[in-house]
């Protein structure tokens, strides 16, 4: 491109601009005779002749267009506009190229696991709807009235029942197709049932059919009852509701493969139906001899009940399960029915619950795990369902005999009590991927304690420590049990602490833990590349 | 108080398919299971099979091959069918409600095999 | 398959006797056994369930008793009524089975 044409083409820009930007130069009147017949908003100036015209028109307003055009032209500023051009090209193909070598170098995002319902949160048993609704109460109709209650523990499923009818060991008195009317009519369950939906809460409806007897499966082998548990999960499937449990299945003949039927039907029906069985065992083969032959059951059982509250033993206790059950999927109890109270003492609550929510699985809790509820500190009431404590009037067989923190009521009201840090564990169980279905590893921390960190991908990573002694210890975090992908930082966040007087928040240098006596500690701390 | 009511021809050519219908009235029919048994001529009772009303069923594994148990839910009424019929099948056919035990019967209807 | 054995098919008492009859189990069926009563052209009519519960409006000289694989009604005063047959049926395991009968005549 020769210079001259490169001036013309500046011309005719220089031309083509809006009339209001041409160059107003009194030296020159060129930009007005080139710009053509008077236009809207321009102003020819009359060139004049006087002296002090003269010295204002001297004064200097920018270079005229000639001048311009002129400079534009030079082979310099012609070099310096193309050196400015490749420049900026060289510039964004080279962010171009930055920009994809770091998103083709950079680590993928993990791809996240299928999530069933029951993956997120936890499970929340009412064995015994007249227990739970207190005196006087105890039907379906008045559980409805409770499920705001549920809602305010972000508890993911209602375990409910047994509700059938069931005439202790009598076979035929047992039908697992009607409900027993002192607890409603099927018009309160579907009723039930439809709240429970709106408020997101899933209903599970335990099966076992001789639940007011002495052997859940009757006293002999009675084939005609699990045969007609086909038809019962057949009916109550299709009244809506998500998932059964059946408890004490090491009574049942043939357990597994009756298992595999019933898993069969409910799946068959939606993926998104569970199947849970409890066993009272506490053996590690028989409880897998159940898992074997059917995934995505899940189990509860008194596996961790005899974890004779050691850190070491707990540690050893939980890793072989997990271990054993390989990557299946997990639930986290003390029994299949019982209360936390009827194994753990009031010291180590906190403790457990703090376990169980942060447990790679589902936890799985009995209506007043929650608040403590102990059967022992009530008289008169049963071991396997004693009154709910909704508050100080829900036992008034012995005045005084309950006090306001003993109470859901009390407990509400206090931000330090067991209910709270059961409302906060659940609400962070069901909203943190790490907790959600992060990775798992334990390692040592020192005796009495049982460590562990649960991570997924680059989010948010958890660290726990529980001290199930009655000292305080010192926890030496040994990260060199870790993998590279879940190391320690040298600080960590406080989220909660099972005993008060921490400084929630703050950050805690690692290797300077100190545990009190039956605490456990959940931190908090970022993914580092 | 429900009430069962069987019905169906009375005579079945050999190898011919047995056809039979129990009414249920006084009650419904869902959330039960209805059974069919049968009494041949000077001898005793033989249980058929059951139905429930979403459709499942439980057969006699000795009449399993041969045997159609059905229900009607709209019209109160659940049916047997039982096929390839020989003179061994000639009986009185009873529709009954199962709990296990056999609470409610109907009256009976005798069923005949012969060309 | 259980096998119900009822081994007296026919059994002769008077009016105002007390008579037993029985039934064998060939496996244990706990307490699942129910027995019925039989008249000529009729159905069968629940008397005992769970072994020895008695159904809603039977008399109570119809009494039930056994369990594992012996079991046994008693009628005690027999009425010229009781003149019918009775069948003992297992519901411990499908299929449900029935026991051959026993003809009870009056002298």
């Known amino acids: 491109m020769s210079q001259d044409t490169e001036v013309d083409m500046k011309e005719v820009e220089l031309n083509e601009l809006e009339p209001e930007k041409q160059p107003m130069n009194a030296a020159s009147g060129a930009a007005m005779s080139l710009a053509g017949a008077e236009k809207n908003g321009l102003v020819k100036i009359k060139v004049a002749e006087d002296e002090a015209e003269a010295a204002a028109a001297a004064k200097f307003t920018g270079l005229s267009k000639e001048e311009l055009l002129k400079v534009a032209g030079s082979p310099g500023w012609v070099r310096t506009r193309w050196a400015l051009l490749l420049l900026f090209w060289l510039g964004w193909l080279g962010m171009l190229a930055g920009a994809v070598v770091i998103i083709v170098r950079a680590p993928r995002c993990r791809e996240l696991p299928a999530q069933k319902w029951w993956h997120t949160g936890a499970l929340y048993r009412i064995g015994d709807l007249q227990a739970f609704q207190g005196h006087g109460a105890g039907n379906l109709a008045g559980l409805k009235g409770r499920l705001d209650y549920l809602s305010s523990l972000k508890v993911k499923g209602l375990v409910l029942g047994p509700i059938h009818k069931n005439q202790k060991d009598d076979v035929a008195q047992t039908d697992l197709l009607q409900i027993d009317p002192n607890f409603g009519s099927k018009e309160d369950f579907d009723s039930l049932l439809q709240s429970a939906k709106k408020k997101s809460i899933r209903v599970i409806l335990d099966l076992t059919p001789n639940y007011r007897g002495e052997n859940s499966w009757f006293s002999t082998q009675v084939d005609t009852v699990a045969t007609k548990v086909k038809d019962a999960l057949e009916f109550w499937l299709q009244a809506g509701v998500d998932g059964f449990q059946v408890r004490d299945i090491e009574n049942l003949k043939d357990a597994s493969s009756f298992l595999a039927e019933w898993q069969n039907i409910t799946k068959g029906f939606s993926e998104d139906r569970l199947l849970i069985a409890g066993t009272n065992s506490s053996d590690l083969q028989q409880i897998l001899s159940l898992l074997e032959s059917n995934k995505d059951l899940l189990l509860t059982s008194s596996y961790l009940s005899d974890s004779g509250s050691t850190g070491e033993h707990t540690k050893s206790l939980v890793t072989q399960y997990l271990n054993a059950t390989g990557n299946r999927w997990c639930s986290w109890s003390l029994s299949q029915a019982r209360l936390l109270t009827s194994f753990l003492p009031a010291q180590l609550l906190r403790l457990y619950q703090l376990m169980l929510f942060t447990l790679p699985g589902t936890p799985v809790f009995s209506y007043g795990d929650e608040i403590g509820l102990d059967a022992a500190a009530l008289p008169g009431q049963p071991m396997e369902a004693p009154v709910m404590l909704w508050d100080e009037s829900s036992f008034p067989d012995i005045p005084g005999a309950v006090s306001a923190n003993m109470t859901v009521k009390g407990q509400s009201e206090d931000p330090g009590s067991l209910l709270s840090l059961f409302r906060r564990l659940s609400d962070q169980r069901s909203k943190e991927r790490s907790l959600l279905h992060g990775d798992f590893h334990a390692f040592s921390a020192g005796p009495g304690l049982f460590s562990y960190i649960r991570h997924w991908d680059q989010n948010e990573r958890f660290l726990v420590v529980l001290n199930f002694g009655d000292v305080g210890l010192s926890a030496g975090l040994q990260a060199s049990d870790l993998p590279a992908s879940a190391s320690l930082p040298a600080k960590a966040d406080l989220l909660l602490s099972t005993q008060p007087g921490r400084e929630e928040g703050s950050p805690l240098e690692l290797e300077r833990l100190k545990l009190e006596p039956h605490e456990g500690l959940l931190l908090r701390f970022p993914y580092a590349a | 108080q429900v009430q069962l009511q069987e019905s169906g021809p009375g005579l079945v050519k050999p190898s011919e398919t047995l056809s039979l219908t129990c009414t249920v009235s006084?009650?419904?029919?869902?959330?039960?299971?209805w059974s069919w048994i049968r009494q041949p001529p000077g001898k005793g009772l033989e249980w058929i099979g059951y139905?429930?009303?979403?459709?499942?069923?439980n057969y006699n594994p000795s009449l399993k091959s041969r045997v159609t148990i059905s229900v009607d839910t709209s019209k109160n009424q659940f049916s047997l069918k039982l096929s390839s019929v020989t003179a061994a099948d000639t009986a009185v056919y009873y529709c009954a409600r199962e709990t296990y035990y056999f609470d409610y019967w109907g009256q009976g209807t005798l069923v005949t095999v012969s060309s | 398959d259980i096998v119900m054995t009822q081994s007296q098919k026919f059994m002769s008492t008077s009016v105002g006797d007390r008579v037993s009859v029985t039934c064998k189990a060939s496996q244990n069926v706990g307490i699942n056994v129910a027995w019925y009563q039989k008249k000529p052209g009729q159905p069968p009519k629940a008397l005992i369930y769970?072994?020895?519960y008695r159904y809603s409006g039977v008399p109570d000289r119809f009494t039930g008793s056994g369990s594992g694989t012996d079991f046994t009604l008693t009628i005690s005063n027999v009425q010229s009524e009781d003149l019918a047959e009775y069948f003992c049926?297992?519901?411990?395991?499908?299929?449900?089975?029935f026991g051959s009968g026993t003809k009870l005549e009056i002298k």
């Open positions: 049926q297992q519901y411990n395991s499908y299929p449900l089975t």
């Open positions: 139905i429930y009303n979403s459709g499942s069923t």
């Open positions: 769970s072994a020895a």
């Open positions: 006084g009650g419904s029919i869902s959330s039960s299971y």
